[in-house]
């Protein structure tokens, strides 16, 4: 059962796993959610009735029954982890804590103009977990405007104390706001010979890499495959760090793989969600339950629905035993990973999908692309919406993309002459316009947010957000697309598609079925040559064939230019403008979404 509200002046008795320090009860709940075993917590707020050494303690708790006895205690705030909830969760914490000193290892001290600059410095420093900044009102003259970057083994402070005229906060790496280089390569036959901060068992290098990414101290890793000569080290995932943040020594060794934490590109890839099945593989761990199941998929579902289950092993039924049902072993461990991995016993193993909601929804698998043909199939582009106006009569106005459960990203030029959001309707999960009838459900628009620098499509800033009146429940036919990460600015996208119900030629009509076209990106320099009379800025991106023939057209405006990278779809562009449609040497011009990520986050995360 999902319980989101916090219980004031209440303490959960027993079940302690560990104690950490957090600046608020809200953040304690997040820490509990991300901890592999925590289901409940008790936080102690600052209070004259409470011993100051206990202020800001966050006690993480577990319970077989998923609850614990409640005791009244002033200044205690208790609650449940979000593991039990189905909604999207995030470790991103932009809060600034006034008059709090978050203690850790102070490894870097420098002068900064503001707390924001200090936070940016922390976000762009590979080791930094949190910071404390002494404001210009700080009593000690030589410490004023000093920005202290800090780290700890756990990523949370070792203590928190009250201190006047300082502010503290966390790195925004988990908000995808780091400018640190994103290094995606996995190096085969390579061992990084740096200090190990931890080791876990993993079925492959990809899972090892994901574990490294969400481990607070891990910067790179080495994984020993199941063919590694030393039997005791097979499937071992070594989590590593170094002073420089980079591996100091690389040793060539067969059957080992190494790679980097993806903390600076984490919103582009699933980090917590290990969705693969591992055949002829047994995961060992503490047994939670043994249940009969028809298949390994059914076993994974059972594990996902059991809040304490972290991973499972399924043993298929022998011949006609037990109505063809096999045994599903639901398991857990102290760190969320198997304690040992065995091969050759015939089991099929995998992980809970409960943690998938800790990743951005947009990274989860969607239907495979349909090759050939121009008409889309249902569920192929689940982020695409059709935006209708009801005035003077109802009609398709523009395309748009779901980027959050209450947010549509589209083009600003779509709203020329639109006086009020009341006349707008957003339809999602639509393949054919003919499906839209009087009684078809839609999302009303609460607010239209147009970029304040927008004047006309051709001069840029052609971007707008629609805040919906109600939230979108994600399904296979309606789900968000990922925004490109700032860390991916230099990715060269090769698999890009434009979609929409727009005209198929310049003088045409709105199409019934959602159309798609694969279109190559064109460099801005090449694009500028084709549009001598316009300024193609870095905030625009162009796509099209030199010979023409495939392009967006009237009615596609506001829709997505979607590019697949590392198995994840990104909203690279918003259909904006062009000369004619699909003309030779006249590429389509799109709003370059990566340049507006900060603007989008600022508008969608504003309180």
């Amino acid at each position: 059962e999902c319980v989101t509200q916090l219980l004031k002046d209440t303490c959960f008795e027993g079940g302690d796993i560990t104690t950490v320090f957090t600046p608020s009860a809200k953040y304690c709940q997040v820490v509990c959610t991300y901890h592999p075993r925590c289901l409940l917590f008790t936080f102690t707020a600052e209070s004259p009735s409470e011993d100051p050494t206990r202020w800001f303690t966050c006690v993480l708790k577990d319970s077989v029954t998923e609850t614990l006895p409640r005791v009244n205690r002033t200044a205690a705030i208790s609650g449940y982890s979000f593991k039990q909830c189905s909604h999207q969760i995030s470790a991103c914490n932009k809060d600034i804590y006034v008059d709090l000193d978050m203690k850790g290892i102070n490894y870097n001290s420098s002068v900064a103009k503001s707390a924001q600059e200090c936070q940016e410095r922390c976000t762009d420093d590979v080791h930094c977990h949190f910071f404390t900044y002494a404001t210009r009102q700080f009593p000690s003259l030589e410490h004023r405007n000093i920005c202290l970057l800090k780290h700890t083994q756990t990523g949370t402070p070792t203590r928190i104390t009250k201190l006047d005229k300082v502010v503290s906060g966390f790195s925004l790496k988990s908000c995808a706001l780091s400018n640190l280089a994103c290094i995606r390569d996995i190096f085969p036959n390579t061992v990084f010979a740096d200090s190990n901060i931890d080791s876990v068992m993993a079925p492959d290098a990809f899972v090892c890499g994901r574990i490294c990414t969400h481990h607070p101290g891990c910067l790179f890793f080495t994984f020993f495959s199941q063919e590694w000569p030393k039997e005791s080290q097979r499937n071992l995932c070594l989590l590593k760090t170094s002073e420089s943040g980079l591996p100091s020594t690389r040793i060539k060794k067969s059957k080992a793989l190494s790679g980097f934490s993806l903390q600076s590109c984490r919103h582009s890839i699933p980090v917590f969600c290990h969705s693969s099945f591992y055949h002829d593989t047994d995961f060992l761990g503490e047994e939670l339950d043994i249940v009969a199941a028809k298949s390994h998929e059914a076993c994974q579902k059972l594990c996902t629905n059991a809040v304490r289950c972290q991973f499972f092993t399924y043993t298929p039924a022998q011949a006609s035993c037990n109505e063809g049902k096999g045994k599903c072993y639901l398991k857990l461990s102290s760190n969320g990973s198997p304690t040992k991995i065995l091969h050759g016993r015939g089991g099929i193993s995998g992980y809970t999908l409960r943690l998938c909601k800790m990743d951005n929804e947009c990274t989860t698998k969607i239907k495979p692309r349909i090759v050939g043909g121009t008409a889309s199939v249902r569920g192929e582009w689940p982020w695409q919406v059709t935006l209708h106006t009801t005035s003077p009569t109802q009609r398709h106005l523009c395309g748009g993309s779901i980027i959050g459960n209450q947010w549509i990203l589209t083009a600003a030029h779509c709203f020329y002459g639109v006086e009020s959001p009341k006349i707008l309707r957003v339809y999602s999960g639509i393949l054919n316009q003919s499906e839209i009838k009087e009684d078809t459900s839609f999302f009303g628009v609460q607010e239209i947010i147009i970029h304040d620098q927008y004047k006309m499509a051709e001069s840029g800033y052609d971007i707008a957000l629609l805040k919906l009146e109600t939230t979108v429940n994600y399904t296979d036919s309606q789900r968000p697309i990922c925004l490109p990460s700032k860390g991916d600015r230099n990715v060269i996208y090769t698999d890009c598609w434009v979609t929409g119900w727009g005209y198929r030629k310049l003088r045409d009509k709105i199409q019934n079925t959602l159309q798609k076209a694969k279109i190559p990106l064109v460099t801005n320099e090449e694009c500028q040559k084709r549009y001598r009379g316009h300024k193609i800025t870095h905030k625009m991106i162009c796509a099209g064939y030199r010979e023409g023939g495939k392009d967006a057209c009237k009615g596609d405006s506001g829709g997505p230019l979607s590019c697949k990278h590392n198995e994840v779809w990104h909203l690279v562009g918003i259909t904006s403008w062009g000369e004619g449609c699909a003309q030779r040497e006249r590429p389509g011009v799109y709003t370059n979404v990566v340049e507006y990520v900060d603007w989008i986050l600022e508008k969608t995360q504003a309180v």
Epitope: D124, V126, S178, N179, L180, A181, C182, I183, R184, D185, F187, L219, S244, G245, L246, P247, S248, T249, R250, N490
Partner: nanobody
Framework: QVQLQESGGGSVQAGGSLRLSCVAS????????VGWFRQAPGKEREGVAA????????YYADSVKGRFTISQDNAKNTVYLQMDSLKPEDTATYYC?????????????????WGQGTQVTVSS
């Protein structure tokens, strides 16, 4: 003692090409970030391109994407910047820099070692 030495600068017409080289002594490019930066008179130094030598991951400023290519020759401990379709606004002193930590690749403030620079002039 660490030394980075740039070469290959010169004068060229708009649309032309140049190839800059950066050779290191006392510092190995292997396992490190190497960046090319430029500074025009009266302007701040800006990142142009960078490479992480271990895997060859590359990073480019938007203004040079598709025109400039950074590459490496680990055996020669040399990093190159191939500059094509040059424009007058590319005129600047180009510097090679080496980092010893994991950095934002185009942020000049985070690089430790610097060369003396080589002048590139593009005329229209």
């Amino acid at each position: 003692q660490v030394q980075l030495q740039e070469s290959g600068g010169g004068s060229v017409q708009a649309g032309g090409s140049l190839r800059l080289s950066c050779v290191a002594s006392g510092y190995t490019f292997n396992n490190n970030f190497v960046g090319w930066f430029r500074q025009a008179p009266g302007k701040e130094r800006e990142g142009v391109a960078a490479i992480y030598s271990l895997g060859g991951s590359t990073y480019y400023a938007d203004s040079v994407k598709g025109r400039f290519t950074i590459s490496q020759d680990n055996a020669k401990n040399t990093v190159y910047l191939q500059m094509d379709s040059l424009k007058p606004e590319d005129t600047a002193t180009y510097y090679c820099a080496g980092a010893i930590t994991w950095v934002p690749p185009l942020s000049h403030r985070r690089y430790t070692y610097w060369g003396q620079g080589t002048q590139v002039t593009v005329s229209s």
